[in-house]
Amino acid sequence: GMEVRWCATSDPEQHKCGNMSEAFREAGIQPSLLCVRGTSADHCVQLIAAQEADAITLDGGAIYEAGKEHGLKPVVGEVYDQEVGTSYYAVAVVRRSSHVTIDTLKGVKSCHTGINRTVGWNVPVGYLVESGRLSVMGCDVLKAVSDYFGGSCVPGAGETSYSESLCRLCRGDSSGEGVCDKSPLERYYDYSGAFRCLAEGAGDVAFVKHSTVLENTDGKTLPSWGQALLSQDFELLCRDGSRADVTEWRQCHLARVPAHAVVVRADTDGGLIFRLLNEGQRLFSHEGSSFQMFSSEAYGQKDLLFKDSTSELVPIATQTYEAWLGHEYLHAMKGLLCDPNRLPPYLRWCVLSTPEIQKCGDMAVAFRRQRLKPEIQCVSAKSPQHCMERIQAEQVDAVTLSGEDIYTAGKTYGLVPAAGEHYAPEDSSNSYYVVAVVRRDSSHAFTLDELRGKRSCHAGFGSPAGWDVPVGALIQRGFIRPKDCDVLTAVSEFFNASCVPVNNPKNYPSSLCALCVGDEQGRNKCVGNSQERYYGYRGAFRCLVENAGDVAFVRHTTVFDNTNGHNSEPWAAELRSEDYELLCPNGARAEVSQFAACNLAQIPPHAVMVRPDTNIFTVYGLLDKAQDLFGDDHNKNGFKMFDSSNYHGQDLLFKDATVRAVPVGEKTTYRGWLGLDYVAALEGMSSQQC
C-alpha cells in the first residue's frame, strides 16, 4: 500500500517519529507513516532525493539547499504562536543616539544571538555578503566577519580560529564563567542577550528578531538590566540606508524569515502530505493527547520533527522553495552558502593576447604569493566569443567583457556577472549615457517620436553612442523598420540626410554621407577618422552646431566638453550649453544637465562574467582582497591590477580606467547589469542580424 516515509535525524527524533507513526496508525490515518533514520538533515535530503525517504521538516537554510541542489519542494508550513503568519523578521537594531546605518557597519561592534543562528548570523551575514558590503574570500565567512566588524559577541564562536574578534564583546555569566558559550551561561546569548549587548553599550548593532526590542523594554522584562530601557531609544537599520522606529519592522528589516516547512520530492503529491499531517494535528496537537505532535518534552529534547512552538501546520500554495523563502531570505542564503569543500582550487581566467597572457601570469604569481584563494590560472582564447564558448564548456571560468559582449555572453551562453568595474566619477569615457542633443528651438521643436525626415549627426558607423544605441533604440521602438535586415538603407530612408562617417564605404547609402563635410579642403568626406570634421562625438555635435543636422547622437558629456569655454576651437568658442536640449524617450525635452533621467541608454561598465553555477561571491571576494593589495596604480606590492603599461598594451584583463572592482549587488543577470534601455537597443540591432 501507499506510505509516507518520514526521515528522522537522531535517536530521539526516531523515537518520536515511531510514536507518531503508531498514533497515526491507531487513529486510522492514511496513508501509513513510516520512519527512516538519517544521520543529519543533509543526509535526509539526500535520502529523499534518492527515493529512500519521502519527507522531513527543514529550516529556511536547509530548504534553500534542498530546493536548489536536489529539486525538493516545500508542501506544508509551520505557523507559530506570537509570530506573523508563517514567518518572522530579522532586524538590525542600533541605539537612537548613534549614527550607524547599514552602509556604515564596517568597523562597528556587533552583537549576535549565536553562531549559525538564523536572525543572529545567517541572515545578517548572508545579506551583507549578497549586497556586496562584505566580501568573503575562499568561503572563509568567519574570517570575513571578524575582519569586517570592530569586535563582536557571537556565542558559540569560541571554538573557531577567529574567537579573539568574534568573542571580544562576550562576558559570560556574573562570575565570568561560560564566556562566548552558545548557552544561557553567556549573558549576551540568544535574542534578549544580543539586545542586552547593545543596550549595555558593549556593541553598536544587534541582530535580533522583530519582537526582541519590544519584549525587552518599557518595563516588560524582569531582569534588572532591562527594566529602565525604553523602546524609543532604539531604531532599526533599513536596507536602503535609512533608519526607522522599532515598530516599523514590517517595512524595515534585513529579511522576512520563513517558517520551517515539510519538503518532499517534486513528484510527491503535496496535498496528500498535508492531508496526512492535518488529520494528525487535528487529533494530536491538544494538551494531554496520547501523542503530541508539537511537543518534544517526552523525549528529552526540543523541536523534534516539528518546532515545539508550532501552533498549526498549513498547506503551501506555491510549492517552490523560492516562493516559500521569499526573495529577501533567498538572497541572504545565496550570500551565506559557500562550501569550502566545494570551492574549486583555481579560477581560470580567459586571456586574448600575448600581453594579456603575460599580465595574467604575473597576476597569478602575485595572488599566490599573498595566499589569495582561489588561485588564478590563465587560459587563452582567440576572441571574446571563444572565451564565452570555453566558459560555457567549463574549460575556463571567468573573463572581463564590454557591454555588447556581456549581452552575447548572457543571452547566448547563459553567463552571469560576478563583479564589475568602477571608474572615477569624472571619467565619462568608460561608462556614460547616450543622448540625443537638439538645438533649443521653440518654433520648430520636435520630440524623439518625430525624428523621421530630420537630419542626423552620428559619431561614426558602429560607434556605441553614435550608431549602435540610437539606431537600435529606434528599431526597437518601431520607428525604423529595416527590410531584409538592411539597416543602412532603413536608416538612410528614415532620416532626410545624415553624416555617419565610415571606414569602408562600399555599398554605403549616399544619404548617410550627405551632411558630412570632410577636411578644410573638402577632401576625405565621410571618412571614419578625424580628417572628417564631423567625425567622433565632438564632430557630431559640431554637425548640429553648424546647422548641418537637427539632432546629434553623442555622449552625455559631449555638450559640456564643447560649450561654456571648454573648447577654444572657433566653431565652439562662443557656444553656451543652455542653447541645447535633450530628447527623452518619454517624448519630452530636457535640459542637458538632466542626462541621467533623459537618455537613450547608459553604456554599462565592463563586468567579469562567469557560469551561473559559479559562486559569484567567491569571485568578488578574491578580487576585493586582491585590489586591497594591487588595486592602486602606485602600490608597492609588485603588481598593478588596473594598469597595463608594463605590458605594452592597454586594458589588459581589466580596463586601465578601473578604480575598483565592485560587487554586482542586485544586478545578478546580464540584463540587470546592462540595464533595460541598453539591452533594448542591442536587441533592436541584433534583431537585424540575419
Epitope: E3, A27, S32, L34, H286, G288, S290
Partner: antibody, heavy 119, light 112 residues
C-alpha cells in the same frame, strides 16, 4: 495506578437499551483510547469500539447501527449505549485503556460487569 | 474480520513444565509500516484479562521473564518456560494490525 470500573444494570429486557458507565481513576480520559470489549459465554471476546482522547469514536462494523460511546471529561467517565438488545447481547462487558506506551494493546482492564438480556 | 485461531483449546501441564500456545492469523499481521501488532492476554479465574505481551515479543511491565513471545507473519507462539500455579487461566492472542481488533478463541492452561 490506573483503575477502571464498569457499572450499570445486570439485567436488560430485549429491545431495550443497554447503558454502562466506565469510571477511570489514575489517568485522564483526555489521553489515550478508551474501549469497550465484551466476552460471551464460552470465552469468545469481541471488540466493540472506542472513544479517543480527542473525542473521536470508532465502532465495530458488526455493531455500528446500535452502538454509541460518549464521555464526560469532567467526571472522567465514558459510557456505552447498545440499542435494541437481544439475548445474543448477553455477555460480560469490560472497559479497557489503550495507549501508545504498549503500541495500543489493552494494558488496563476493568473488572467487568455481567449483563443478561432476558424478559 | 481477521480470524485468529488458537491451539490447543486446553493445555494440561505440570507445575515447572514448559508450556507453548500457538496462534495463527487468517492473513499476515505485518503492517505496511513494518510492525506486527500481535498481543497476548491472560484472564485468570474470576478476574479481567491482563496484558502479558505486546507487539509479538515485548513483555508488559511486571510480567515475569518466564513469559516470552515469538513469531512472524501469520504464526505466533507464547511460551512459559516454567509454569507456576499463578499462571493458570485462559490465554488469548489478539491482533490490532487490522481494524477492528480481533481475539483468538482462548487456550485454557490447567494442571494435569
Amino acid at each position: 495506578e490506573v483503575q477502571l470500573q464498569e457499572s450499570g444494570p445486570s439485567l436488560v429486557k430485549p429491545s431495550q437499551t443497554l447503558s454502562l458507565t466506565c469510571s477511570v481513576t489514575g489517568d485522564s480520559i483526555t489521553s489515550g483510547y478508551w474501549n469497550w470489549i465484551r466476552k460471551f459465554p464460552g470465552n469468545k471476546l469481541e471488540y466493540m469500539g472506542y472513544i479517543s482522547d480527542s473525542g473521536i469514536t470508532y465502532y465495530n462494523p458488526s455493531l455500528k447501527s446500535r452502538i454509541s460511546i460518549t464521555r464526560d471529561t469532567s467526571k472522567n467517565q465514558y459510557y456505552l449505549q447498545l440499542n435494541s438488545v437481544t439475548a445474543e447481547d448477553t455477555a460480560t462487558y469490560y472497559c479497557a485503556r489503550r495507549t501508545l506506551a504498549t503500541y495500543y494493546a489493552m494494558d488496563y482492564w476493568g473488572q467487568g460487569t455481567s449483563v443478561t438480556v432476558s424478559s | 474480520d481477521f480470524v485468529m485461531t488458537q491451539t490447543p483449546l486446553s493445555l494440561p501441564v505440570s507445575l515447572g513444565d514448559q508450556a507453548s500456545i500457538s496462534c495463527r492469523a487468517s492473513q499476515s499481521l505485518v503492517h505496511s509500516n513494518g510492525n506486527t501488532y500481535l498481543h497476548w492476554y491472560l484472564q485468570k479465574p474470576g478476574q479481567s484479562p491482563k496484558l502479558l505481551i505486546y507487539r509479538v515479543s515485548n513483555r508488559f511491565s511486571g510480567v515475569p521473564d518466564r513469559f516470552s513471545g515469538s513469531g512472524s507473519g501469520t504464526d505466533f507462539t507464547l511460551k512459559i518456560s516454567r509454569v507456576e500455579a499463578e499462571d493458570l487461566g485462559v490465554y488469548f492472542c489478539s491482533q490490532s494490525t487490522h481494524v477492528p481488533p480481533t481475539f483468538g478463541g482462548g487456550t485454557k492452561l490447567e494442571i494435569k
